[in-house]
């Protein structure tokens, strides 16, 4: 019989008492085969973290800073359940740390040196740890003691709870630096008042502070937020302009064998019976013998953290950077305007080899990082392990939802001004063998399908979006008799046609021979009835243009396109017979890397782009003999985006809407995780 006990870790006598009450009340409402609670008492949160790692306890609720400690080796814990605040309809699991300034003050984030600062309190998250952590490498050396470095960075501050004797500048704006509400500039409202009164130039608070202190929009409009990219935004645009997004209070468990489903089952049932306004005799979010015992008193309920989300992703790049800077205190030798090497994310073995060759030729400008799937690469870019990669539009959408931005677009047509003219897009098509003359768009049910990969534009999002509109359900594996859609569940009929061996079968990378445009076309040639690819795929792999044994004798005339009106046309008539126009593949990165990725890639394409004529004796960035490694092989150049510099603007309203409609069919664990952080 599986053990269905969750051992909750308590850090005080009062918490242990509430835990026992929690245990007893759960016993009275949960059937005997359901989850149960046991209580383990430890002296501190760090002891609880160690106990969970050592399998002596299973769960504890932590503030963000401790979630970071819990994630670090050797603890390796992960967030599993989040407390939420506000309403069930609009649950808030995060808050945003922001830098507020007066509208007319005219400086940016990178011009804070010499300004006057207002903090909620020394050592507090939004008011100190996050802003000072992010500014850490700009502080004057020596950076220890930290208070002295901060005092020398700003021209005056109010940092309640600081030592006014040793660091008088930190108390210059609030004599005495009192550590309670007796100090008018203490806490969130106090730090904002410090700015409002004109004592300081910038206040480090949370996003709700401004709304709680200024009910009137006209008054709020006198303030702005400083963004990390050295721009400003209105105070209500905090989701796009903050220092960090911080989880409020989170249950953590072991990463392996951590009982996360059991913990969720327990807490979900607990909130049903003992949540807000549920029961008089025991209340989960109330602490008669103290404050915030086991859970925050202000919490309204729990939400399950998506399983794909590790602590780094949950805490976010900015928060992790700030806390790591403060804890480790390491900075580059001397901060320069020089760009660091761009860490390119390569998918599996073959892309890694091409990336390595690029890296050698780039002379220190490009480094390589590997991952097994596109989503793993996106996650690595999010957390700073990698910086950039080029993505199909479907993944540009996921990357955008995860906070990444497009920076350059692949262009596929030769033109005089290639780098300045991003193209409208390419065509997604459905290809069939000419010999299968009875096959049309209207009778694909029961046929064998070939897809570039799940989540990609031409191979999945466009054809499956159109199909969804017709069949109104997501069981595409039942619609087709079998197929190869790399990235599908291994036991799905949409992996049946795939050719990868062993663990590589149906993997969404080049280890699966039917992956990508060329792979999907090969699948059609060898096994399938229809392939969903781009309009250039057939000509690029016929007439001897692909020397591989399976392709070298193929003839373009032996294939036709399915049109949406039920007719068929020759391959060259794609402009009048396609499923939809698809946005070109684009390079994505984090916002903080945007300028450097742009600069370095433009240099790299001038060295190794289409201007290189002999690819047998030189490194060519946009060539890999039909394998589309790192970039599509038909890329002519990487083009500037001009003002299409967000994923929505880049992909266009129509495509974003189409992918949004398919979201209910999404199997993307990363998309689920990212929409948890930003619904």
């Amino acid at each position: 019989v599986p053990d269905k006990t969750v051992r909750w870790c308590a850090v005080s006598e009062h918490e242990a008492t509430k835990c026992q009450s929690f245990r007893d009340h759960m016993k009275s409402v949960i059937p005997s085969d359901g989850p149960s609670v046991a209580c383990v008492k430890k002296a501190s949160y760090l002891d609880c973290i160690r106990a969970i790692a050592a399998n002596e306890a299973d769960a504890v609720t932590l503030d963000a800073g401790l979630v970071y400690d819990a994630y670090l080796a050797p603890n390796n814990l992960k967030p599993v359940v989040a407390e939420f605040y506000g309403s069930k309809e609009d649950p808030q699991t995060f808050y945003y740390a922001v830098a507020v300034v007066k509208k007319d003050s005219g400086f940016q984030m990178n011009q804070l040196r010499g300004k006057k600062s207002c903090h909620t309190g020394l050592g507090r998250s939004a008011g100190w740890n996050i802003p000072i952590g992010l500014l850490y490498c700009d502080l004057p050396e020596p950076r220890k003691p930290l208070e002295k470095a901060v005092a020398n960075f700003f021209s005056g501050s109010c940092a309640p709870c600081a030592d006014g004797t040793d660091f008088p500048q930190l108390c210059q704006l609030c004599p005495g630096c009192g550590c309670s509400t007796l100090n008018q500039y203490f806490g969130y409202s106090g730090a904002f008042k410090c700015l409002k009164d004109g004592a300081g130039d910038v206040a480090f608070v949370k996003h709700s502070t401004i709304f709680e202190n200024l009910a009137n929009k006209a008054d709020r409009d006198q303030y702005e937020l400083l963004c990390l990219d050295n721009t400003r935004k209105p105070v209500d645009e905090y989701k796009d302009c903050h220092l960090a997004q911080v989880p409020s209070h989170t249950v953590v468990a072991r990463s392996m064998g951590g009982k996360e489903d059991l913990i969720w089952e327990l807490l979900n049932q607990a909130q049903e019976h003992f949540g807000k306004d549920k029961s008089k005799e025991f209340q989960l979010f109330s602490s008669p013998h103290g404050k915030d015992l086991l859970f925050k008193d202000s919490a309204h309920g729990f939400l399950k953290v998506p399983p794909r989300m590790d602590a780094k992703m949950y805490l976010g790049y900015e928060y992790v950077t700030a806390i790591r800077n403060l804890r480790e205190g390491t900075c580059p030798e001397a901060p320069t305007d020089e760009c660091k090497p761009v860490k390119w994310c390569a998918l599996s073995h073959h892309e890694r080899l091409k990336c390595d060759e690029w890296s050698v030729n780039s002379v220190g400008k490009i480094e390589c990082v590997s991952a097994e799937t596109t989503e793993d690469c996106i996650a690595k870019i999010m957390n700073g392990e990698a910086d950039a990669m080029s993505l199909d539009g479907g993944f540009v959408y996921i990357a955008g939802k995860c906070g990444l931005v497009p920076v350059l677009a692949e262009n596929y047509n030769k033109s005089d001004n290639c780098e300045d003219t991003p193209e409208a897009g390419y065509f997604a098509i459905a290809v069939v063998k000419k010999s299968a003359s009875d096959l049309t768009w209207d009778n694909l049910k029961g046929k064998k399908s070939c897809h570039t990969a799940v989540g990609r534009t031409a191979g999945w999002n466009i054809p499956m979006g159109l199909l969804y509109n017709k069949i109104n359900h997501c069981r595409f594996d039942e619609f087709f008799s079998e197929g190869c859609a790399p990235g599908s569940k291994k036991d799905s009929s949409l992996c049946k046609l795939c050719m990868g061996s062993g663990l590589n079968l149906c993997e969404p990378n080049n280890k699966e021979g039917y992956y990508g445009y060329t792979g999907a076309f090969r699948c059609l040639v060898e096994k399938g009835d229809v392939a969903f690819v781009k309009h250039q795929t057939v000509p690029q792999n016929t007439g001897g243009k692909n020397p591989d044994p399976w392709a070298k004798n193929l003839n373009e005339k032996d294939y036709e396109l399915l049109c949406l009106d039920g007719t068929r046309k020759p391959v060259e008539e794609y402009a009048n017979c396609h499923l939809a126009r698809a946005p070109n593949h684009a390079v994505v990165t984090r916002k903080d890397k945007e300028a450097c990725v742009h600069k370095i890639l433009r240099q790299q394409q001038h060295l190794f782009g289409s201007n290189v004529t002999d690819c047998s004796g030189n490194f060519c960035l946009f060539r890999s003999e039909t394998k589309d490694l790192l970039f599509r092989d038909d890329t002519v150049c990487l083009a500037k985006l001009h003002d299409r510099n967000t994923y929505e603007k880049y992909l266009g309203e129509e495509y974003v809407k189409a992918v949004g409609n398919l979201r209910k069919c999404s199997t993307s664990s990363l998309l689920e995780a990212c929409t948890f952080r930003r619904p």
């Epitope: 073959h350 080899l353 091409k354 060759e357 050698v360 030729n361 890999s624 003999e625």
Partner: nanobody, 117 residues
Framework: EVQLVESGGGLVQPGGSLRLSCAAS????????MAWYRQAPGKGLELVSG???????KYADSVKGRFTISRDNSKNTLYLQMNSLRAEDTAVYYC???????????WGQGTLVTVSS
């Protein structure tokens, strides 16, 4: 297509040195990039060092300052001088000229380097 044959591996004590050679069956003068990779037991292939036709070099962080890559176009040979060897350098070492354009899984026999006391 140029064939490549690696040699020079062997058993060496920690702190010792070895020089690996990679002899090509044809001219390497026009080859853009050559590199040494290694594969430790149970691990994936890892780039150790690379060199361009113009002589620009790159090294993995773990070997910087200890290994030196060079190519002699007149002898059609790529070299890897390995000094201050450590136990973690134990692996099969392969050379490549990237001419198979990444996707054909062709690697030579390699040469085994064992660092042990």
């Amino acid at each position: 297509e140029v064939q490549l044959v690696e040699s020079g591996g062997g058993l060496v004590q920690p702190g010792g040195s070895l020089r690996l050679s990679c002899a090509a069956s044809g001219s390497i003068a026009s080859i853009a990039t050559m590199a040494w990779y290694r594969q430790a037991p149970g691990k994936g292939l890892e780039l150790v060092s690379g060199i361009t036709r113009g002589g620009s070099t790159k090294y993995a962080d773990s070997v910087k300052g200890r290994f030196t890559i060079s190519r002699d176009n007149s002898k059609n040979t790529l070299y890897l001088q390995m000094n201050s060897l450590r136990a973690e350098d134990t692996a099969v070492y392969y050379c490549t000229d990237y001419s198979r354009k990444y996707y054909q899984d062709y690697w030579g026999q390699g040469t085994l380097v064992t660092v042990s006391s």
